[in-house]
Interface confidence: medium
């Protein structure tokens, strides 16, 4: 009995559902009463899910697996694995027995995109050319381990004195911290690129260091020049700082965070105490750091709707303010590719190739390429639709006349995260069916 599974590993994002495809060819007159189907871990032989004696025996895998029962009679023995975890990674074997028996193993490769790196500088005050500084690039909750590259403003690699460490967090996802020690020039840009080798997604962070400006009479309020990028569902820190004078006490401080455009109150600290969040209880100050001049605001469980500009007002005797932009982002899933028609294809046929990628933000840029990487511009229709959380599902359709054979690649780019998700389909010259049987 021939059992067919994908040759390549099935890549699944942490928290999503994965389908481990497995199929067999039922003979005429086949009934499910004849079928024994067993899914097990390839290495330890432990049972994951089974169908025997004409019925689904259920999940032995923490109730996170399911069969496609309505498709079993047609030879679809695929397994659905729900809410994928890092610990699920590995090989699963699909055993099918009717009269004869056959088996095949499919690999599950778990992945999670890395967040846009946050950059910190130490020391970060009164810097002069010739000073040695430590620049830290931190990117969170990715899987598997990242590759980290440093570059200068011209894109040339910075290799000297870099220490990179990676640690699994409470869910087995990796937080990566890369530290670059460098002697400052007159000014300079230092970029860090965190690459997920499985998703082929790159996350970029950069910091530009210029000489300090001299202080003015008013309270100088400092915020990041670049937008703060936050992944949907994570917490974001809107950084804001001021320089307290000697003898400063919190009783003198009035701190107000508000939406820049509508002036609506988000959070305040007045009369020596935290007045709390006016923003659905999702904001907090760093109260233990306020006296040192840290007026930053923590925004929890970021949503698409939070995107925009926030103003930090600081008043002691004088007053100052500055606005910081929050840019919300979510990575796009690896594109799925479909082909229509998908049977008996011949050179000269016109086909429609659809590339679909899900739950990203903001809107994606979609590029089509041939097997040589040359752009395919003609007859492409791309649509993007916001789902119930405001995240975008993108569908790009390419109409093309088949050559003798060819590869058609779709690249879905998140312009904020600078993360690229790739999908491709190869169509050979012989009459064929897609996906291959």
């Amino acid at each position: 009995l021939e059992v067919q599974v994908p040759e390549d590993p099935v890549v699944a994002l942490v928290g999503t559902d994965a389908t481990l495809r497995c199929s067999f060819s039922p003979e005429p007159g086949f009934s499910l009463a004849q079928l024994n189907l067993i899914w097990q871990l390839t290495d330890t032989k432990q049972l994951v899910h089974s169908f025997t004696e004409g019925r689904d025996q259920g999940s032995a895998y923490a109730n996170r697996t399911a069969l496609f029962l309505d498709l079993l009679a047609q030879g679809n023995a695929s397994l659905r694995l729900q809410r994928v975890r890092v610990a699920d990674e590995g090989s699963f074997t699909c055993f099918v027995s009717i009269r004869d028996f056959g088996s095949a193993a499919v690999s599950l490769q778990v992945a999670a995109p890395y967040s846009k790196p946050s950059m910190t500088l130490e020391p970060n005050k009164d810097l002069r050319p010739g000073d040695t500084v430590t620049i830290t690039c931190s990117s969170y909750r990715g899987y598997p381990e990242a590759e980290v590259f440093w570059q200068d403003g011209q894109g040339a690699p910075l290799t000297g004195n870099v220490t990179t460490s990676q640690m699994a967090n409470e869910q087995g996802l990796f937080d990566v911290h890369s530290v670059l020690r460098v002697v400052l020039g007159a000014n300079g840009t230092y970029s860090c690129l965190v690459r997920n080798p499985v998703l082929q997604q790159d996350a970029h962070g950069s910091i530009t260091i210029t000489p300090q400006r001299s202080p003015t009479g008013a309270v100088e309020v400092q915020v990041p020049e670049d937008p703060v990028v936050a992944l949907v569902g994570t917490d974001a820190t809107l950084r804001c700082s001021f320089s307290p004078e000697p003898g400063f006490s919190l009783a003198q401080l009035n701190l107000i965070w508000q939406l820049t455009d509508t002036k609506q109150l988000v959070h305040s600290f007045t009369e020596g105490r935290d007045q709390g969040s006016a923003y659905a209880n999702r904001t907090a100050l760093f109260l233990d750091l306020l006296a040192q001049g840290n007026a930053s605001l923590r925004l929890q469980r970021v949503r698409v709707a939070d995107e925009g500009s926030f103003t930090c007002f600081v008043s002691i005797r004088d007053f100052g303010s500055a606005a910081v932009s929050l840019q919300v982002a979510a990575p796009y899933s690896k594109p799925s590719m479909t082909l229509e028609p998908n049977k008996d294809l011949r050179p000269g046929d016109t086909v429609t190739i659809t590339c679909s990628s899900y739950r990203g933000y903001p809107e994606a840029e979609v590029f089509w390429q041939d097997g040589q990487g040359a752009p395919l511009t003609g007859n492409v229709t791309t649509s993007q639709m916001a789902n119930e959380q405001g995240l975008f599902d993108v569908h790009s359709v390419l109409r093309v006349v088949l050559g003798a054979n060819g590869t058609y690649s779709c690249l879905v780019r998140n312009p904020v995260l600078q993360q690229d998700a790739h999908g491709s389909v190869t169509i050979t010259g012989q009459p064929m069916t897609f996906p291959p049987e």
């Epitope: 290495d43 432990q46 895998y61 923490a62 996170r64 975890r85 967090n169 087995g172």
Partner: antibody, heavy 120, light 107 residues
Framework: QGQMQQSGAELVKPGASVRLSCKTS????????ISWLKQKPGQSLEWIAW????????SYNQKFTGKAQLTVDTSSSTAYMQFSSLTTEDSAIYYC?????????????WGAGTTVTVSS | DIVMTQSHKFMSTSVGDRVSITCKAS??????VAWYQQKPGQSPKLLIY???YRYTGVPDHFTVSGSGTDFTFTISSVQAEDLAVYYC?????????FGGGTKLEIK
């Protein structure tokens, strides 16, 4: 970062059994594999077995099959190892340690170890 | 089972010296080797895994080279706090196995 707190030292007689515990905190118990390892004084480490709390799967080093039995209590995020038919050869420090998956058998967080002494 | 062999049980060194510890696998383990440090009365600490990934907080004077069957763990400038036993471990296939350990001592 996560902690693993192991039960106290045990003095047991030959032929008896012992149950060691490893209480975890600071990470999602069902997202990691827990392994147990043995170290005799002045010697190297031996991997005994792992357990994956999610579905309760286990995998044993053949050398310890029938000797060790791993279980978990997910409600308290605690892993247990029952060690049976003890002989003086079983006197050692036993560590629990976590790892990310069955394909990633390196141990990033360790318990402090439980000393088991088998003596009549 | 895959046997991991650390040829030196003891290595004498001085503070500031460069020292290399070797580990040989009885069969190809690709890059699936981890290195641990263990001080007296403590549990082992993960330093490096998958041949080249540095665990968080591990100083950068620890480096590793090699793949396949031959691996080298190097301390570029030995500090007093580096005196300990170092173990290599293959995480290529179960049963996962450790080398016999190399104890770093001061001359």
């Amino acid at each position: 970062q996560g902690q693993m707190q192991q039960s106290g030292a045990e003095l047991v007689k030959p032929g008896a059994s012992v149950r060691l515990s490893c209480k975890t905190s600071g990470f999602t118990f069902s997202s990691f594999y827990i392994s147990w390892l043995k170290q005799k004084p002045g010697q190297s480490l031996e991997w005994i077995a792992w357990i994956y709390a999610g579905p309760g799967y286990t995998s044993y080093n053949q050398k310890f099959t029938g000797k060790a039995q791993l279980t978990v209590d997910t409600s308290s995020s605690t892993a247990y190892m029952q060690f049976s038919s003890l002989t003086t050869e079983d006197s050692a420090i036993y560590y629990c340690a976590r790892h990310v998956g069955r394909q990633r058998g390196y141990f990033d967080v360790w318990g402090a170890g439980t000393t088991v002494t088998v003596s009549s | 089972d895959i046997v991991m062999t650390q040829s030196h049980k003891f290595m004498s060194t001085s503070v500031g010296d460069r020292v290399s510890i070797t580990c040989k696998a009885s069969q190809d383990v690709s890059t699936a080797v981890a290195w641990y440090q263990q001080k007296p009365g403590q549990s082992p600490k993960l330093l490096i895994y998958s041949a080249s990934y540095r665990y968080t907080g591990v100083p950068d004077h620890f480096t590793v080279s090699g793949s396949g069957t031959d691996f080298t763990f190097t301390i570029s400038s030995v500090q007093a706090e580096d005196l300990a036993v170092y173990y290599c471990q293959q995480h290529y296939s179960t049963p996962w196995t450790f080398g016999g350990g190399t104890k770093l001592e001061i001359k």
